[in-house]
Interface confidence: medium
């Protein structure tokens, strides 16, 4: 079969929360990628940022391929992750309303994601090996969530380490591409 | 060539349960997931949900959530959907599909279900 | 859920004729620069058969008259010439989004 990157082929497997893969050391250099692998279009600037609300959590794209030990994604994907503190925009620059918001004893309003988009990828490995369809699970949008010191470890772990280790982030995924499109390291997947 | 074989019918009586097959061969099992779609008769086609062969998971339309349950055997390079507690609503034939990062490319012929005591 | 609505739901063509035919979602099925759409041909007794992925790309083994386009929410599937092994009825669906969804069917006929 041709190694077309704009075919309908392969497994998918969608990691843990959490359990994503950290970006390769080089981004995406946007001028490899030819028309039918970006769809005629330049994808998302990496450190590219976007206001949600007054509050200032923000999400954050990066592009990377999703990798399976020797195999790797046949376009890059753009991963979402969410970063900001949560006070009022008006408040953060003021020291006093930021010492009040972010009090230790008060509530912890935190920038975690909101919206998850399983993402189907087509990954192609060396070797003759069948390219395979995989399915990574990013997130789609963040959002500010208030957690109290008593059940903050239980709400966060409801988010892996994406709130925690934001640089882990995911990107919402398309669903209808060949199989042999994408995948993530799956060292998280289930 | 890629073929998915399912048997042609099933005739069940209402509030019993089905066990539908799918063979795959033609190309590496694990390497695709296994769609399964129903079609009533003169009706349009429904996504019931899909498993990834190489592990096992699945997703379901949440409409048949209650209704399906799809499994693979690896070694035989099949597919099963097992139907439960079936009516007359569930009279229907189901393909099973292979699929990719964007349409299901490959299809069986199809099983005719038919529910009636 | 992703509502697809087809249009229209049946259309003579004569042969050697253009038929259009028309899927609106009910939101966007595009994602990071491809569009999730796929068009499928159905004939009486036999299972769908894939004849365009991501809007726009010819399944292989498909004949080149069968074309599609759109973006967003919009998309066509052209047939053009119509022959007469044609006469079928011709679905879309999306996969942007679980569940996949279909829309409900275009039924081709020739005069």
């Known amino acids: 079969q041709g190694w077309q990157a704009f075919k309908n082929d392969a497994t998918e497997i969608i990691p843990e929360l959490g359990e994503y893969p950290e970006p390769p050391p080089e981004l995406e250099n946007n001028k490899t990628m030819n028309r039918a692998e970006n769809g005629g279009r330049p994808p998302h600037h990496p450190f590219e940022t976007k206001d949600v609300s007054e509050y200032s959590c923000r999400e954050l794209h990066f592009t990377r391929y999703v990798t399976d030990g020797p195999c790797r994604s046949a376009k890059p994907v753009t991963e979402l992750v969410c970063s900001g503190q949560c006070g009022p925009a008006r408040l953060l620059p003021n020291a006093i309303g930021r010492g009040k918001w972010w009090r230790p004893s008060g509530p912890d309003f935190r920038c975690i994601p909101d919206r998850y988009r399983a993402q189907r990828v087509q990954l192609l490995c060396p070797g003759g090996e069948a390219p395979r369809a995989r399915k990574v699970r990013l997130v789609a949008s963040c959002k500010c969530k208030r957690l109290t010191r008593f059940h903050n470890q239980s709400e966060l772990k409801d988010f892996g380490t994406e709130a925690a280790r934001p640089q882990k982030g995911r990107k919402p995924r398309p669903r209808a591409r060949s199989a042999k499109a994408n995948q993530a390291e799956l060292e998280n997947a289930y | 060539q890629v073929q998915l074989l399912q048997p042609g019918a099933e005739l069940v009586k209402p509030g019993a349960s089905v066990k539908l097959s799918c063979k795959a061969s033609?190309?590496?099992?694990?390497?695709?997931?296994m769609h399964w779609v129903k079609q009533r008769p003169g009706q349009g086609l429904e996504w019931i949900g899909e498993i990834n062969p190489s592990n096992g998971r699945t997703d379901y339309n949440e409409n048949f959530k209650s209704k399906a349950t799809l499994t693979v055997d690896k070694s035989s390079s099949t597919a099963y959907m097992q139907l439960s507690s079936l009516t007359s609503e569930d009279s229907a034939v189901y393909y099973c599909a292979r699929g990719g990062v964007y349409a299901m490319d490959y299809w069986g012929q199809g099983t005719s279900v038919t529910v009636s005591s | 859920d992703i509502v697809l609505t087809q249009s229209p739901a049946s259309l003579a063509v004569s042969l050697g004729q253009r038929a259009t035919i028309s899927c609106k979602a009910s939101?966007?099925?595009?994602?990071?620069?491809?569009?999730?759409m796929n068009w499928y041909q159905q004939k009486p007794g036999q299972p769908p058969k894939l004849l365009i992925y991501?809007?726009?790309n010819l399944e292989s083994g498909i004949p080149a008259r069968f074309s599609g386009s759109g973006s967003g929410t919009d998309f066509t599937l052209n047939i053009h010439p119509v022959e007469e092994e044609d006469a079928a009825t011709y679905y879309c669906?999306?996969?942007?989004?679980?569940?996949?969804?279909f829309g409900g069917g275009t039924k081709l006929e020739l005069k």
């Open positions: 939101q966007s099925v595009d994602y990071d620069g491809d569009s999730y």
């Open positions: 991501a809007a726009s």
């Open positions: 033609g190309y590496t099992f694990t390497s695709y997931w």
């Open positions: 669906q999306q996969s942007n989004e679980d569940p996949w969804t």
